[in-house]
């Protein structure tokens, strides 16, 4: 999906008001310095692409985050504020959600969510130069 036409300010507002808090809750008990940020993004559409991928695509060691509250809220925000956010995209993540049997917070998942926090922070500061 091409995130170019999303209403970025509305997505930012949704992140600041609710998604960020859920990410913090998920990471509670973890030191902010515990993980290095290895995933980056260069502009807002790119950030949303990376956020979408890390949130909904299963990775080795972290089967799925799709049932977490921050993921459901992310999907809702994209469904509302990205025109034509593809039905296949949403259907794919729903299929993943159904396959998931139980919530297990692994260290790999914590690392992945830490990366997500970094991507969201970057999304919120689009005018900053890449480090």
């Amino acid at each position: 999906y091409d995130f170019t036409n999303c209403d970025f300010e509305k997505i930012k507002a949704a992140y600041l008001s609710t998604i960020s808090k859920d990410l913090i809750t998920y990471m509670s008990g973890t030191k902010s310095t515990e993980f290095n940020n290895t995933v980056s993004c260069s502009n807002r559409p790119h950030c949303l692409t990376e956020i979408q991928s890390l949130t909904f695509n299963p990775t080795a060691g972290c089967a799925s985050l799709a049932k977490e509250m921050f993921a459901m809220k992310t999907k809702a925000a994209l469904a509302i504020w990205c025109p034509g956010y593809s039905e296949t995209q949403i259907n794919a993540t729903q299929a993943m959600k159904k396959r998931r049997k139980r919530k297990v917070t692994t260290n790999k998942c914590l690392e992945q969510v830490s990366q997500l926090q970094g991507l969201w922070r970057r999304f919120n500061r689009p005018l900053l130069k890449q480090q």
Epitope: A14, A76, A79, I80, P83, G84, E87, I90, Q94
Partner: antibody, heavy 120, light 111 residues
């Protein structure tokens, strides 16, 4: 039973406000969108706005911006629609409708409707 | 923010097929696959018949089908039955400024 139950008919004076409630049961209220749609006598359907409690997002149709307020109480699974500065043209049946989860623009469940009559 | 355009009326005999059109623009029907159709009997709430322009919710007879070409969506009712007599409304997602548009409605009469 999956349903939306709305409050009863209202008769209002021009210039006043009306608040209609819509109680959901049988589904997880927060993750769906609850839209409000009205239908004037003998006329078509008109969308007023939507609330998605999961992300605390409320969106209003441009025509009603500033005059309509949609709220939700997740503890009671109830949505509310308040319309202010009423005029005779606001006489209509007001429906709440559930937008499918993440497909907020398809209304797969409707309330029974609430008739609001604006008359002096 | 004008409504989608539907013919005010349509009719057919029992057993026949009838097609109702719904014309929009590239900013709504033409731009997305998010077209839905609702059936409304007098004094009742609308009922979702078609969504995502050609999908049927469970419980809707397969006599109802939807299609889309360019800026126009269509609802076809085949094998007309007396209970199909109702008003039919199309609706489309219209982007993040307008969000939802409805058609003016079509009264379907079964002769």
């Amino acid at each position: 039973q999956v349903q939306l139950v709305q409050s009863g008919a209202e008769v209002k004076k021009p210039g006043s406000s009306v608040k209609v409630s819509c109680k959901a049961s049988g589904f997880t209220f927060g993750s769906y969108g609850i839209s409000w749609v009205r239908q004037a006598p003998g006329q078509g359907l008109e969308w007023l706005g939507v609330i998605v409690p999961l992300v605390g997002v409320t969106i209003y149709a441009e025509k009603f911006q500033g005059r309509v307020t949609i709220t939700a109480d997740t503890s009671t699974s109830t949505a509310y629609m308040e319309l202010s500065s009423l005029r005779s043209e606001d006489t209509a049946v007001y429906y709440c409708a559930r937008g499918q989860e993440y497909f907020y623009w398809y209304f797969d469940l409707w309330g029974q409707g609430t008739l609001v009559t604006v008359s002096s | 923010q004008s409504a989608l355009t539907q013919p005010p009326s349509a009719s057919g005999s029992p057993g026949q097929s009838v097609t109702i059109s719904c014309t929009g623009t590239s900013s709504d029907i033409g731009g997305y696959n998010r077209v839905s159709w609702y059936q409304q009997h007098p004094g009742k709430a609308p009922k979702l018949m078609i969504y995502e322009f050609n999908k049927r919710p469970s419980g809707v007879p397969d006599r109802f089908s939807g299609s889309k070409s360019g800026n126009t969506a269509s609802l076809t009712v085949s094998g007309l039955q007396a209970e199909d007599e109702a008003d039919y409304y199309c609706s489309s997602y219209a982007g993040t400024d307008i969000f939802v548009l409805f058609g003016g409605g079509t009264k379907l009469t079964v002769l």
